[in-house]
């Protein structure tokens, strides 16, 4: 329908990242109407041909999407009314990473905003004490990361040391032969501290600490994608 | 920077071949849609062919369909045309140019003259 | 194909002259209508995508409305760097023609 002479609407996204393999969301949100008939929406890539995902008349309208997309997008139908424009992206891929616009047309008028889409690997890592080494060690380990990652070891009675010196990192390739597992090992640890092994690339940081006592050892971890306001 | 260098041009006989290449620099090749557009000398512009990023879907305007093959070398970061059967009215300035959102084209290269004459 | 029609095919006008040009699809092509301005021996340059979607660097005084079959163009105060070519092209299915242009001259 034409929309000549109608106001723009406020369309909001928030840059994210996507976790190789599996599935993401890229968000988009808009001033919703009173009539999901009355609304479209259409999700672009830069540099893509074709859409990335097209819904009007409350169902999906996918003649125009892109090779590269197909069988891979939904939108989420029933939070359509409400103004959600949220894609799903099903099995994300390295080459998904790129700016995304996600236009929007409804009674009210029409509007667009860009998205920072990354794609990468990022995971958990886990502490534990390595009970096979001949000294106190730890052995931190990630199953899944790209690009490489820094590993940097920290201690909370250490505060501010460099342990580079007595801790080895090692990449190994996985089988799909883009993610790497991660493996970091901590030589001459002392009990009664608590450690932390930190991994970071450019789309996410991740800490796995430990605590190492006589009588029990505590583990926790927790994982941040950075440059997403999400 | 982007940049865009075509080359490859000259002149060539009627029912001669030539293939044209499209240096790539400043952005990740392989994400973007390339096209070529050319221009008849004190004409308009006509859009050519266009090819996906990954180089499996390719386009082509009916006036160079079974003559004209686009194709990319992503590893080399160049676009390709390869002109068979020239004819008269396929002088023009060849540019090749980028997809920026759909076919929209930005930036575009400088352009290369082909001169089919005999 | 989807035929694109431009008017006029030349215009003459004055600095600071508010001008306009019309493009027209022979089909709806929603708002997937690119605008571009060519001066003599350069290559083109995109103003304008999605029918009014301006471009990264390109001035103000340039604006695009339309959607459907009928398109405008408008510069609001023509500049001394303003006098080109102008050309439209639909964007939503291949082949992806052009308009034949519009060559906007000093008076």
């Known amino acids: 329908f034409g929309i000549s002479g109608r106001h723009s609407i406020t369309v909001t996204t928030v840059a994210s990242a996507g976790n190789i393999g599996e599935d993401g969301i890229l968000s988009c949100t808009f001033e919703p109407d009173i009539k999901l008939s009355d609304i479209v929406i259409q999700w672009l890539k830069e540099g893509v041909l074709g859409l990335v995902h097209e819904f009007k008349e409350g169902k999906d309208e996918l003649s125009e999407q892109d090779e590269m997309f197909r069988g891979r997008t939904a939108v989420f139908a029933d939070q359509v009314i409400v103004g959600n424009a949220s894609l799903r992206l099903k099995n994300v891929q390295l080459t998904d990473a790129g700016t995304y616009k996600c236009y929007i047309i409804t009674s009210k008028g029409k509007g667009n905003a860009n998205l920072e889409y990354k794609t990468g690997a990022f995971s958990m890592p886990e502490v534990n004490v390595d009970y096979n080494a001949s000294s106190e060690t730890l052995r931190c380990e990630a199953p899944r990361w790209f690009p490489q990652p820094t590993v940097v070891w920290a201690s909370q009675v250490d505060q501010g040391a460099n342990f580079s010196e007595v801790s080895n990192t090692s990449f190994e390739l996985n089988s799909e032969n883009v993610t790497m597992k991660v493996v970091s090992v901590l030589y001459n640890v002392t009990i009664n501290n608590t450690y932390s092994c930190m991994i970071e690339n450019d789309i996410a940081k991740a800490t796995g600490d430990i605590k190492v006592t006589e009588s029990e050892i505590k583990r926790r971890s927790h994982l941040q994608l950075l440059n997403s306001k999400a | 920077e982007v940049q865009l260098l075509e080359s490859g041009g000259g002149l060539v006989q009627p029912g001669g071949s030539l293939r044209l290449s499209c240096a790539a620099s400043?952005?990740?090749?392989?994400?973007?849609?390339m096209h070529w557009v050319r221009q008849a000398p004190g004409k308009g512009l006509e859009w050519v062919s266009g090819i996906s990023g990954s180089g499996g879907s390719t386009y082509y305007a009916d006036s160079v369909k079974g003559r004209f093959t686009i194709s990319r070398d992503n590893s080399k970061n160049t676009l390709y045309l390869q002109m068979n059967s020239l004819r008269a009215e396929d002088t023009a300035v060849y540019y090749c140019a980028r997809t920026q959102w759909r076919a929209s084209l930005d930036p575009w290269g400088q352009g290369t003259l082909v001169n089919v004459s005999s | 194909d989807i035929q694109m029609t431009q008017s006029p095919s030349s215009l003459s006008a004055s600095v600071g002259d508010r001008v306009t040009i019309t493009c027209r699809a022979s089909?709806?092509?929603?708002?997937?209508l690119a605008w571009y301005q060519q001066k003599p021996g350069k290559a083109p340059k995109l103003l304008i995508y999605?029918?009014?979607t301006l471009q990264s660097g390109v001035p103000s005084r340039f604006s695009g409305s339309g959607s459907g079959t009928d398109f405008t163009l408008t510069i609001s105060s023509l500049q001394p760097e303003d006098f080109a070519t102008y050309y439209c092209q639909q964007t939503t299915m291949s082949p992806y023609t052009f308009g034949q242009g519009t060559k906007v001259e000093i008076k």
């Open positions: 089909q709806d092509i929603s708002y997937w």
């Open positions: 400043g952005f990740t090749f392989s994400s973007y849609g």
């Open positions: 999605g029918a009014s």
